[in-house]
Amino acid sequence: MKVLQEPTCVSDYMSISTCEWKMNGPTNCSTELRLLYQLVFLLSEAHTCIPENNGGAGCVCHLLMDDVVSADNYTLDLWAGQQLLWKGSFKPSEHVKPRAPGNLTVHTNVSDTLLLTWSNPYPPDNYLYNHLTYAVNIWSENDPADFRIYNVTYLEPSLRIAASTLKSGISYRARVRAWAQCYNTTWSEWSPSTKWHNSYREPFEQH
């Protein structure tokens, strides 16, 4: 039994880091493998992660972490019974994938303005809470070409756009994702999308 693709890990910079790897053949990850991880820290203790299958030869492990700070460094040991298959390390702050924003809501009752709001996925005491920026994706269900991205570079989790920038009388969907420049993170997954019917009063034409 050998590791074909070494574990790569990403952290949500809160409580979970996810490691994925591939074996050289079909493997029952949960019965055959264990991933041990330990904070490089005086008097810390090793923890065991039981991996799940992720495709035939792929494995994934969700490492539970009691908070994360920038100095954290973990040792990782992948075991098959008594055999050490791979040894490595992982610094969560260098491999951050933020959590996806939630509770995306479209408020359509604000005088021809669409107000989109969502929730910051981090609690106020987490470092990323004040460092997230967002991308909002809006698209038409009827017209695949009607697809736009709005970059929200301020901290407030909201976006205002004029309803008239979208077509009237048709349905739209929106979703939002986050990233943090301070840790050069990857983008989060997209939030679940939300749907609304866009309608607004056309201004009277004056002759």
């Epitope: 008097l43 810390s44 700070v69 100095a71 954290d72």
Partner: antibody
Framework: EVQLLESGGGLVQPGGSLRLSCAAS????????MHWVRQAPGKGLEYVSG????????YYANSVKGRFTISRDNPKNTLFLQMSSLRAEDTAVYYC?????????????WGQGTTVTVSS | EIVLTQSPGTLSLSPGERATLSCRAS???????LAWYQQKPGQAPRLLIY???RRATGIPDRFSGSGSGTDFTLTISRLEPEDFAVYYC?????????FGQGTKLEIK
């Protein structure tokens, strides 16, 4: 209420031994690394020794290595420090302290301390 | 072994002023953690800051920590009468634990 209560301090002659105890209440001892920190009269804080939550690993400052032994009894919620070959420079208030990995070594609960005096 | 040096040894300020306490490590500490404690006469120390910049439970937001590498700072934005005490920095790393010698913050 979360509390640490040290006992076992006293006056001892140079070369003698003492066993300090620390009774924990209001929390589960086995979830925390535990430590002893001392403070000589009018001086600053000095780290003495620590033990991991399960007791599987220990650490000693160079000044006490080979003379002091830290141990714990998690079911009884008690921490110990066995001190032998005591010297005058071991005279201090000894604090029992807890730390959780979440606090990255920050010691969030301290006992009120027990005084050890080494003198002839 | 890393040595922590705190400065100044004594800081004399008045209530309402801003206090800046320094803690310098003898070598860079990328994978270690810095904490700050407050100790009043006859009392055990109290944890203020852990992980360089995170406030411990119940600590007022006038206390803040910052720094990296070898230089770390505890800032008290607006001194209250109860803040006058001795402050210690502490380094907790992969192989050792060390305290600074302390800074006494006294009323001017």
């Amino acid at each position: 209420e979360v509390q640490l209560l040290e006992s076992g301090g006293g006056l001892v002659q140079p070369g003698g031994s003492l066993r300090l105890s620390c009774a924990a209440s209001g929390f589960t001892l086995s979830s925390y690394a535990m430590h002893w920190v001392r403070q000589a009269p009018g001086k600053g804080l000095e780290y003495v020794s620590g033990i991991s939550p399960s007791g599987s690993s220990t650490y000693y400052a160079n000044s006490v290595k080979g003379r002091f032994t830290i141990s714990r009894d998690n079911p009884k919620n008690t921490l110990f420090l066995q001190m032998s070959s005591l010297r005058a420079e071991d005279t201090a208030v000894y604090y029992c302290v807890r730390s959780k990995v979440r606090y990255r070594g920050g010691m969030d609960v301290w006992g009120q301390g027990t005084t050890v005096t080494v003198s002839s | 072994e890393i040595v922590l040096t705190q400065s100044p040894g004594t800081l004399s300020l008045s209530p309402g002023e801003r206090a800046t306490l320094s803690c310098r490590a003898s070598q860079g500490i990328s994978s270690a953690y810095l904490a700050w404690y407050q100790q009043k006469p006859g009392q055990a120390p109290r944890l203020l800051i852990y992980g360089t910049s995170r406030r411990a439970t119940g600590i007022p937001d006038r206390f803040s920590g910052s720094g990296s590498g070898t230089d770390f700072t505890l800032t008290i934005s607006r001194l209250e009468p109860e803040d006058f005490a001795v402050y210690y920095c502490q380094l907790y790393g992969a192989t050792s634990v060390t305290f600074g010698q302390g800074t006494k913050l006294e009323i001017k």
